[in-house]
């Protein structure tokens, strides 16, 4: 199975690392320091 982080969600996380949680079939973002929000777009 393809990792969506390498495809359609490649640019989903603005200031963070995209992580695909296989168990949940969901994408989440691990934000860089000082950033937060679903896409790590808030500071």
């Amino acid at each position: 199975k393809k990792n969506p982080c390498n495809a359609e969600f490649q640019n989903f996380c603005i200031h963070g690392e995209c992580k695909y949680i296989e168990h949940l079939e969901a994408v989440t973002c691990k934000c860089q320091q000082e950033y937060f929000g679903e896409r790590c777009g808030e500071k």
Partner: antibody
Framework: EVQLVESGGGLVKPGGSLRLSCAAS????????MSWVRQAPGKGLEWVST????????YYPESVKGRFTISRDNAKNSLYLQMNSLRAEDTAVYYC??????????????????WGQGTLVTVSS | DIVLTQSPASLAVSPGQRATITCRAS??????????INWYQQKPGQPPKLLIY???NKDTGVPARFSGSGSGTDFTLTINPVEAEDTANYYC??????????FGQGTKLEIK
């Protein structure tokens, strides 16, 4: 109230097949990964299989890979385990278990937070 | 595969005393400061029950006398003080994202 009820266990001959079911209620079934865990008589716990929320990802230990197949029907709130080529060493109580989880700041932590009462599978000639 | 080794295999403790069960992993189960170890209690004839998740977090309704600690490869479940109803088997389990999701072999706790 979360409830998991297993069924389908019984006596089967070596080489035979059996299909276990787990009926879930009291929670949004489609939001949780699910697993089967077994326990041979007088022994410890052994993880048997896991399936992701939508069924796209399945996982097995080497001991059952190629013989067991996990599946789910989210419309019916049901989990299944198809067991083929059964062996004497597959004799055990089979539990279905829900994956509780925490998802925060990019971290995913999971655990078996609810278990059924189990169904006994006996493989014997 | 990660192997979990529990010790002791069994122990007998008097009511009011402390019971300590250890779980050693064959490799680290930590990631970015998070420890992926869970503890379960199983009483005879019953399914397992979650006690502790992520090494040190008590599940809802678990009495304060149960606590978990540790990191890396070494983890501990402590029951203090032990009560008669704590007679059970206890299992650790690793829940990294990589299968197999192994359990320890179990520890049997008997109350004297």
């Amino acid at each position: 109230e979360v409830q998991l009820v297993e069924s389908g266990g019984g006596l089967v001959k070596p080489g035979g097949s059996l299909r276990l079911s787990c009926a879930a209620s009291g929670f949004t079934f489609s939001s949780y990964a699910m697993s089967w865990v077994r326990q041979a008589p007088g022994k410890g716990l052994e993880w048997v299989s896991t399936i992701s929320t939508g069924g796209s990802h399945t996982y097995y230990p080497e001991s059952v890979k190629g013989r067991f197949t996990i599946s789910r029907d989210n419309a019916k709130n049901s989990l299944y385990l198809q067991m083929n080529s059964l062996r004497a060493e597959d004799t055990a109580v089979y539990y279905c278990a829900r994956h509780g989880y925490l998802l925060y700041e990019g971290y995913y932590e999971w655990y078996f937070d609810y278990w059924g009462q189990g169904t006994l599978v006996t493989v014997s000639s | 595969d990660i192997v979990l080794t529990q010790s002791p295999a069994s122990l007998a403790v008097s009511p009011g005393q402390r019971a300590t069960i250890t779980c050693r992993a064959s490799e680290s189960v930590d990631y970015d400061g998070h420890s992926f170890i869970n503890w379960y209690q199983q009483k005879p004839g019953q399914p397992p029950k979650l006690l502790i998740y992520a090494a040190s977090n008590k599940d809802t309704g678990v009495p304060a006398r149960f606590s978990g600690s540790g990191s890396g490869t070494d983890f501990t479940l402590t029951i203090n003080p032990v009560e008669a109803e704590d007679t059970a088997n206890y299992y650790c389990q690793q829940s990294t994202e990589d299968p197999p999701y192994t359990f320890g072999q179990g520890t049997k706790l008997e109350i004297k």
